[in-house]
């Protein structure tokens, strides 16, 4: 049985203010059972960016259809980027439970925001 890997291929992404940022994340196994969530930052101060359960997350869309079966692509797009969005984004797999528990994190993608071109 294949051990789950969470692949965030981009160490860093630079986006101009007002544009959209795509943050890539793919997984290599459907196991363990449980959801994927995106956060900005690490530790207790981290900010939830997207999951299927909470929300709405009006600026976030999933790159793949949310109804796609056996999907391994959990990339997201964040629209209308502002300097406040700068930070490191983590794609994290949770193990199903009561409550769900964090199982494994991607290495993170650092988002930097450039000034809007004049």
């Amino acid at each position: 049985e294949e051990e789950l890997q969470i692949i965030q291929p981009d160490k860093s992404v630079s986006v101009a203010a007002g544009e959209s940022a795509i943050l890539h994340c793919t997984i290599t196994s459907l196991f363990p059972v449980g959801p994927i969530q995106w956060f900005r930052g690490a530790g207790p101060a981290r900010v939830l960016i997207y999951n299927q359960r909470q929300g709405p997350f009006p600026r976030v869309t999933t790159v793949s259809e949310t109804t796609k079966r056996e999907n391994m692509d959990f990339s997201i797009s964040i629209s209308n980027i502002t300097p406040a969005d700068a930070g490191t984004y983590y794609c994290i797999k949770f193990r199903k439970g009561s409550p769900d528990t964090e199982f494994k994190s991607g290495a993170g993608t650092e988002l930097s925001v450039r000034a809007k071109p004049s």
Epitope: N51, T66, T67, R69, E70, K96
Partner: antibody, heavy 120, light 108 residues
Framework: DVQLVESGGGVVRPGESLRLSCAAS????????MTWVRQAPGEGLEWVST??????YYADSVKGRFTISRDNSKNTLYLQMNSLRAEDTAVYYC???????????????WGLGTLVTVSS | EIVLTQSPATLSVSPGERATFSCRAS??????LAWYQQRPGQAPRLLIY???IRETGIPERFSGSGSGTEFTLTITSLQSEDFAVYYC??????????FGGGTKVEIK
């Protein structure tokens, strides 16, 4: 073609044990969660248990009495049922889970079921 | 635990007619709802998932709609093989996965 074939059902007395098996073919068994669902005579469907890789989940009504397991080398799912009660009498179906990417699981293939009767 | 309530319990319809029945969830399940058909003496068969997506091989006369707490399954022109029991199932919040009590579609 996906095929799920249950076996191991039968008539037992209350308090006894039974082990159900489900032989799977036509898909990469080790890649998918698997589930047992039961249906009492003339009643609706009731979820019993689900297994991922090693992670297991149970309905409250069977927790502590039933154990789900799998042998990926044999493409087989099991349900060990101990301390059986009259209310466990049902057809037990084995089902393959299908995962919707950001959500949960539903069941896209089902076996024909095996009947378990618990009676004194 | 999310409770699913299906109505009506029984629906009497003539062949060729339209059948519509509902599934109500006790709390919001977004679109995380599936529909199954169970013919007498057979195993359930997946018809619809994600509230509205037809499973491969399911005829177009079957359609699902709704989101949140109210869902509907519609069969536009009932064929003889459609007389069966239909169950909804939520997979938004589990364990446990929960099923509705079923709607039996019988010949009028």
């Amino acid at each position: 073609d996906v095929q799920l074939v249950e076996s191991g059902g039968g008539v037992v007395r209350p308090g006894e044990s039974l082990r159900l098996s489900c032989a799977a073919s036509g898909f990469r068994f080790s890649n998918f969660a698997m589930t047992w669902v039961r249906q009492a005579p003339g009643e609706g469907l009731e979820w019993v248990s689900t297994i991922g890789s090693g992670d297991t989940y149970y309905a409250d009504s069977v927790k502590g009495r039933f154990t789900i397991s799998r042998d990926n080398s044999k493409n087989t799912l099991y349900l060990q049922m101990n301390s059986l009660r009259a209310e466990d009498t049902a057809v037990y179906y084995c089902a393959k889970d299908s995962t919707v990417s950001w959500s949960g699981d539903f069941f896209d293939y089902w076996g024909l079921g095996t009947l378990v009767t618990v009676s004194s | 635990e999310i409770v699913l309530t299906q109505s009506p319990a029984t629906l009497s319809v003539s062949p060729g007619e339209r059948a519509t029945f509902s599934c109500r969830a006790s709390q919001n399940v977004k679109n995380d709802l599936a529909w199954y058909q169970q013919r007498p003496g057979q195993a359930p068969r997946l018809l619809i998932y994600a509230a509205r997506i037809r499973e491969t091989g399911i005829p177009e006369r079957f359609s699902g709609s709704g989101s949140g707490t109210e869902f509907t399954l519609t069969i536009t022109s009932l064929q003889s093989e459609d007389f069966a029991v239909y169950y909804c199932q939520q997979y938004y919040d589990w364990p446990p996965f929960t099923f509705g009590g079923g709607t039996k579609v019988e010949i009028k």
